[in-house]
């Protein structure tokens, strides 16, 4: 048998808040008229289902969000990559589940200056994945523990932090018309999650008075 | 029709070191889960540890960790059980068994002596 | 560790009569994903390796005739041979799926009265 590698590389989701895409790269071998087919299953079961739109395409990623939806589930997936000379070659996915592997995107932030506090209002981040009523669940909705770390660099050497669960912040005593970086980030302590930051440059107003 | 075919058992001496193959045909081996499970005489069935053979990834039952270790070569079809530090307990018929959870394929078997 | 307890470990049983094997595991076996049970059962005849029945604690494997059927569900599980032939005396093993280390039951022995 040849090396399925030569053909097919780096199977694996990339998943950003519940957004599950699985990707790959073809092998030193592939070439740009070489076709892939994905499928999936989840853990346990017998049959692969063949991805409806992701049957003999030749882009290198394929969006499992739906068929992956369920949180508390195992799932696998496989790409098979057929090259113009007719070669073959098979590789499947690590075991994905979305809440352990899914990366959290920053979140969304409004930052909003007076004159001597900068106030912070943190928006529900949404996800694709839908409650039994129909209506998509927010991060929050998923993580029950679930928080928000806040910090304001006031100067080179010293920040202020403020943290919790709810949705607006306040960060008090700034000096007025003066700049102020704040960085936000989710974290979820149980999954060991962290955010990247969403960050905010802004100055305070000047003092009319 | 999906074959297994497991090879290099045979008489070892206690602290040696013997590498099992496990050779499948009839599917790529990288396209399910490949697991070791081993019988000693006259006794029942124990799970060794499996391996992702596209990706590597392996999970192992704790009481092996360290001893034992499984990888596959893609390019041969085949998966390994390297065992090192071999005791008279280890004598047992070694299986490879695929996929993920149960195990819907088995090979023959090979078996292992570990004797002085 | 889960701990697989079969009972009896060993039968005998009549041509055409039912033999019924119990597994029992140390917690409970339902996957709540799909509310299925992770258990597999396996059949064992001398010199060979083991073979696939049931698994997903009721689901036939494909070419399994149908006098083999799996039930149960938590921690209590049968495998029951409807009708007895002897082609079926052997070991049979209850495997667990729902946590790692995979754990089988010690096996019981099936043999014809």
């Known amino acids: 048998p040849e090396d399925p590698s030569d053909l097919l590389q780096h199977v694996k989701f990339q998943s950003n808040n519940f957004e599950n895409i699985l990707t790959w790269d073809s092998g030193p071998e592939g070439t740009p008229d070489t076709v892939y087919s994905i499928e999936y299953k989840t853990y346990g079961e017998r049959d692969w289902v063949a991805k409806k739109g992701c049957q003999r395409i030749t882009r290198k990623s394929c969006n499992l969000t739906v068929e992956t939806g369920n949180h508390t589930e195992l799932y696998y997936a496989r790409v098979t990559a057929v090259s113009a000379g007719g070669r073959s070659a098979t590789k499947m996915t690590d075991r994905f589940n979305s809440l352990q592997h899914t990366a959290l995107k920053p979140p969304d932030v409004t930052c909003i200056p007076k004159v001597r506090s900068i106030q912070m209002i943190v928006h529900p981040t949404p996800t694709p994945i839908r409650a039994g009523d129909g209506h998509r669940l927010t991060l929050e909705d998923i993580f029950h523990d679930l928080f928000y770390h806040l910090e304001l660099q006031v100067n080179r050497t010293y920040q202020m932090h403020l943290g919790g669960e709810q949705r607006e912040y306040e960060f008090f005593g700034l000096t007025p018309d003066t700049e102020f970086l704040g960085t936000i980030m989710i974290c979820v302590p149980t999954w060991s999650k962290k955010s990247a930051p969403y960050m905010c440059r802004v100055r305070t107003l000047p003092d009319r008075t | 029709e999906v074959q297994l075919v497991e090879s290099g058992g045979g008489l070892v001496q206690p602290g040696g070191s013997l590498r099992l193959s496990c050779a499948a045909s009839g599917y790529s081996i990288t396209a399910e889960y490949m697991n070791w499970v081993r019988q000693a005489p006259g006794k029942g069935l124990e799970w060794i540890g499996e391996?992702?053979?596209?990706?590597?990834?392996?999970t192992y039952n704790q009481k092996f960790k360290g001893r034992f270790t499984i990888s596959v070569d893609q390019s041969k079809n085949t998966a390994y059980l390297q065992m090192n530090s071999l005791r008279a307990e280890d004598t047992a018929v070694y299986y490879c068994?695929?996929?993920?959870?149960?195990?819907?394929?088995w090979g023959q078997g090979t078996l292992v002596t570990v004797s002085s | 560790d889960i701990v697989m307890t079969q009972s009896p470990d060993s039968l005998a049983v009549s041509l055409g009569e039912r033999a019924t094997i119990n597994c029992k595991s140390s917690q409970s076996l339902l996957y709540s994903s799909n509310q299925k049970n992770t258990l597999a059962w396996y059949q064992q005849k001398p010199g060979q390796p083991p073979k696939l029945l049931i698994y997903?604690?009721?689901s036939r494997e494909s070419g399994v005739p149908d006098r083999f059927s799996g039930s149960g569900s938590g921690t209590d599980f049968t495998l029951t041979i409807s009708s007895l032939q002897a082609e079926d005396v052997a070991v049979y093993y209850c495997q667990q799926y729902y946590s790692y280390p995979f754990t089988f039951g010690q096996g019981t022995k099936v043999e014809i009265k």
């Open positions: 391996i992702n053979p596209s990706t590597g990834t392996t």
């Open positions: 997903w604690a009721s």
């Open positions: 068994a695929r996929f993920d959870a149960y195990f819907d394929y």
